[in-house]
């Protein structure tokens, strides 16, 4: 697994750099997740031929995948920081169900899918710190989330590895969305 | 290897609109911000604006009125139009891929002349 | 938006020489700084990202720093490929900017 943020050699060359501000250990925490994902697409694609796949909009329609839109205030056209915010936070706490189904999908990356499980559950904690309005944030059900995960480990092998693909996709997409809303906070 | 390679007409005339294209080659369309940039003659460059592959754009305000960004994720591509321009629109035209920190990979510019 | 601004707009320099060009924003923009090379009749090139991290390719004699509103980008011992004009551009917000470009020349 790779070294988390805070511990890399860039920061032990720079012993004299300012502490990193809430909003870059936002950022750095978010690079972290994304390199994470950028090994297991890696690993996916090499043992499955999902990444070209043309079925994907298929799988991915039955697949309830946090996604950014217009309303959720996150891009330049009406963006709002407290909207976004707590679209970001739901998002990731939505994502948990599906970073817990990749626990299993991996075989040289076992390690790899687990920081990236932790990792997202301490920037939520950061992101938590940063809101103003928790009581807006809906945490997904556990029982709802239980079946569903029931449900995606029923799935047939084809299902199952598209599943895999489609989450790592959506993940880094919705990061991606985040962190360019985050740096304007 | 991802390159960028645009195309459009070179020469208008004022208060006609201008269209470009920008094809994305050898990897992924998604999960990238398509940029607009331009660079008048001898100057610095300014940033049009961009969308995500989903079709959500953020345009510069000094431009927006004017500017209309397009995706064709069927086809890897992404176009520019800006309407009614003067000759303060001529200028190098690039198209870029934004990564999460900065424009990465660049298309190989199209000069584009506005004149009566 | 954020107003970038670059010193010297020019400088005249020999090989072998070290190089500082400085980058100031209106407004803090934390570490969401990005270097850029461009040649005569070129597409810009990036150098380095996040004010201080190389991108991939470009050689350790170019070096970034700086955080908030001041930044650098160095050129430890000038190379003749390196003739070109720099610019800087911030991240942070919509619209992105860039700094109005230095150019460094042959001395």
């Known amino acids: 697994a790779p070294v988390p943020p805070g511990e890399d050699s860039k920061d032990v060359a720079a012993p004299h750099r300012q502490p990193l501000t809430s909003s870059e250990r936002i950022d750095k925490q978010i690079r972290y997740i994304l390199d994470g994902i950028s090994a297991l697409r890696k690993e996916t694609c090499n043992k499955s031929n999902m990444c070209e796949s043309s079925k994907e909009a298929l799988a991915e329609n039955n697949l309830n995948l946090p996604k950014m839109a217009e309303k959720d205030g996150c891009f330049q056209s009406g963006f709002n920081e407290e909207t976004c915010l707590v679209k970001i936070i739901t998002g990731l706490l939505e994502f948990e169900v599906y970073l817990e189904y990749l626990q299993n999908r991996f075989e040289s990356s076992e390690e790899q899918a687990r920081a990236v499980q932790m990792s997202t559950k301490v920037l939520i904690q950061f992101l938590q710190k940063k809101a103003k309005n928790l009581d807006a944030i809906t945490t997904p059900d556990p029982t709802t989330n239980a079946s569903l995960l029931t449900k995606l480990q029923a799935q047939n092998q084809w299902l199952q590895d598209m599943t895999t693909h489609l989450i790592l996709r959506s993940f880094k997409e919705f990061l991606q969305s985040s962190l360019r809303a985050l740096r304007q906070m | 290897q991802v390159q960028l390679q645009q195309w459009g007409a070179g020469l208008l005339k004022p208060s006609e609109t201008l269209s470009l294209t920008c094809a994305v080659y050898?990897?992924?369309?998604?999960?990238?911000?398509w940029s607009w940039i331009r660079q008048p003659p001898g100057k610095g460059l300014e940033w049009i604006g961009e969308?995500?592959?989903?079709?959500?754009?953020n345009y510069n305000p000094s431009l927006k009125s004017r500017v209309t960004i397009s995706v064709d994720t069927s086809k890897n591509q992404f176009s520019l139009k800006l309407r009614s321009v003067t000759a303060a629109d001529t200028a190098v035209y690039y198209c870029?891929?934004?990564?999460?920190?900065?424009?990465?990979?660049w298309g190989q510019g199209t000069m584009v002349t506005v004149s009566s | 938006d954020i107003q970038m601004t670059q010193s010297p707009s020019s400088l005249s320099a020999s090989v072998g020489d070290r190089v500082t060009i400085t980058c100031r924003a209106s407004?803090?923009?934390?570490?969401?700084l990005a270097w850029y090379q461009q040649k005569p009749e070129k597409a810009p090139k990036s150098l380095i990202y996040?004010?201080?991290s190389l991108q991939s390719g470009v050689p350790s004699r170019f070096s970034g720093s700086g955080s908030g509103t001041d930044f650098t980008l160095t050129i430890s011992s000038l190379q003749p490929e390196d003739f070109a004009t720099y610019y800087c551009?911030?991240?942070?917000?919509?619209?992105?900017?860039f700094g109005q470009g230095t150019k460094v020349e042959i001395k």
């Open positions: 870029a891929r934004e990564d999460i920190d900065d424009f990465d990979i």
């Open positions: 050898g990897g992924s369309f998604r999960g990238y911000y």
């Open positions: 969308i995500f592959h989903s079709g959500s754009t």
């Open positions: 407004q803090g923009i934390s570490s969401w």
């Open positions: 996040a004010a201080s």
């Open positions: 551009q911030q991240y942070k917000s919509y619209p992105r900017t």
